[in-house]
Interface confidence: low
């Protein structure tokens, strides 16, 4: 399978996975009219924008994404989201209210696909194996993250969104323990009472007990 024809960028290695550099190709003149007769996006926005859901990275400290991948994806998003553009609705569409922020005849592959280094076509990511969350010219999909043994899957990896992992019940991860899940505290220190249960991204919360009764 393949996709939106686009200029295949020069390959550059990104931590062992081959990717096409996504570079704005702006110029002094305006873009050609879009298929809807509207004026195209501004020069600075021509590289394309994210049109699918963002991956769950950074949504909360309880969600983990491999740091290397996180940097790769953020790098892609930073280069792909430099401007906004008028949304172009697809004619005669029977798949709900999906909207395009780039022309159907655009220069980037859509989210959920990547640029074939050999044919120049857009190849779909394999569900559960790889994903791309933004319009791109990457030469391979970003590999789906596998949850660690102390984690559980919050949402499965799709073609457009990475796996979301969270700590298993009874454990949590916060900014202080970003790399591993820690066991939740079993109770509050003497003189404090529990006001919030443990969640995958925070330990129990304890506050001072004004009456002096504490829980162990």
């Amino acid at each position: 399978a393949s996709g939106t024809e686009a200029a295949t960028a020069t390959p550059s290695k990104v931590w062992g996975s081959s990717a096409g550099r996504i570079e704005p190709r702006g110029g002094g003149r305006g873009a050609l009219p879009t298929s809807m007769g509207q004026q195209g996006p501004s020069a600075q926005a021509r590289a394309g924008r994210v049109v699918g859901p963002r991956s769950a990275q950074g949504a909360s400290p309880g969600l983990r994404v491999h740091k290397t991948l996180k940097f790769v994806v953020v790098g892609v998003l930073l280069q792909v989201v430099p401007g906004s553009a008028a949304t172009i609705k697809v004619h005669d569409q029977s798949v709900g209210t999906q909207q395009w922020e780039h022309s159907p005849l655009g220069e980037l592959c859509p989210p959920g696909s990547h640029r074939s280094e050999h044919s120049g076509a857009c190849n779909q990511c394999t569900e559960g194996v790889g994903y791309t969350s933004a319009s791109n010219n990457l030469f391979s999909c970003l590999p789906c993250t596998a949850c660690k043994s102390d984690e559980e899957e919050r949402s499965a990896c799709t073609r457009t969104r990475n796996t979301a992992c969270q700590c298993k019940p009874g454990t949590f991860r916060n900014d202080d323990s970003a790399e591993m899940c820690r066991k939740c505290s079993t109770g509050c220190p003497r003189g404090k009472v529990k006001v919030k249960d443990c969640t995958p991204w925070s330990d129990i919360e304890c506050v001072h007990n004004e009456s002096g009764n504490g829980h162990n």
Partner: antibody, heavy 121, light 118 residues
């Protein structure tokens, strides 16, 4: 070998209808976008309509919007163009073309031989 | 004024090199676009020749010899198709097309008729 064979062309009166078909073979039809491109006698190429691999997304030239409908049947390896409210200016050879990709691009890598549609009273 | 302009006709002698021009209207920037070229011989359907964005980013059509090559002049807002060692069978109509956020109603240029002089 990739082959695209158009059929369904012919003589039709203004205001009439016609349905063009394109039989595809020699490739996995369901993984490619497809287009209809026409060429009026002695004129240049004009893109008419395009459809992505699954048939979910369809695009039309302004000149045919609301009158023509592109569709596909992946089980039958076939592409269609339903043409209603035909006008004299729709007279042309209609080519079926395969897109290089799943979605739609400028890269039309294989073309059929075309079928002639004549709209005349 | 059309978005894409091609001279209606050009000619060159057998064995020479010719460069066909596709000019993008000057309120648009060819630096952003890939330029596509199609050949149509008399009585035949069009044939995809090549796509050109830059020297490091281009693709040749199936069975298209390297005599056919693309280039761009961003300053002049033009795309070019060069054909070297002209042969009789190169006599055809050549159409350019632009890729990117282009209006789908302006996919193809008006075409250039190439005549090969013997």
């Amino acid at each position: 070998e990739v082959q695209l064979v158009e059929s369904g062309g012919g003589l039709v009166k203004p205001g009439g209808s016609l349905r063009l078909s394109c039989a595809a073979s020699g490739f996995t039809f369901s993984t490619y976008g497809m287009h209809w491109v026409r060429q009026a006698p002695g004129k240049g190429l004009e893109w008419v309509a395009g459809i992505n691999y699954s048939g979910n997304n369809k695009y039309y030239a302004d000149s045919v919007k609301g009158r023509f409908t592109i569709s596909r049947d992946n089980a039958k390896n076939s592409l269609y163009l339903q043409m209603n409210s035909l006008r004299a200016e729709d007279t042309a050879v209609y080519y079926c073309a395969r897109d290089h990709s799943t979605w739609l691009s400028r890269h039309l890598d294989y073309w059929g031989q075309g079928t002639l549609v004549t709209v005349s009273s | 004024q059309p978005v894409l302009h091609q001279p209606p006709a050009m000619s060159s002698a057998l064995g020479t090199t010719i460069r066909l021009t596709c000019t993008l209207r000057n309120d648009h920037d060819i630096g952003v676009y890939s330029v596509y070229w199609y050949q149509q011989r008399p009585g035949h359907p069009p044939r995809f020749l090549l796509r050109y964005f830059s020297q490091s980013d281009k693709s040749q059509g199936p069975q298209v010899p390297p005599r056919f090559s693309g280039s761009k002049d961003v300053a002049r807002n033009r795309g070019y198709l060069s054909i070297s060692e002209l042969q009789p069978e190169d006599e055809a109509m050549y159409y350019c097309a632009m890729g990117a956020r282009s209006s789908v109603t302006h996919v193809f240029g008006s075409g250039t008729q190439l005549t090969v002089l013997s």
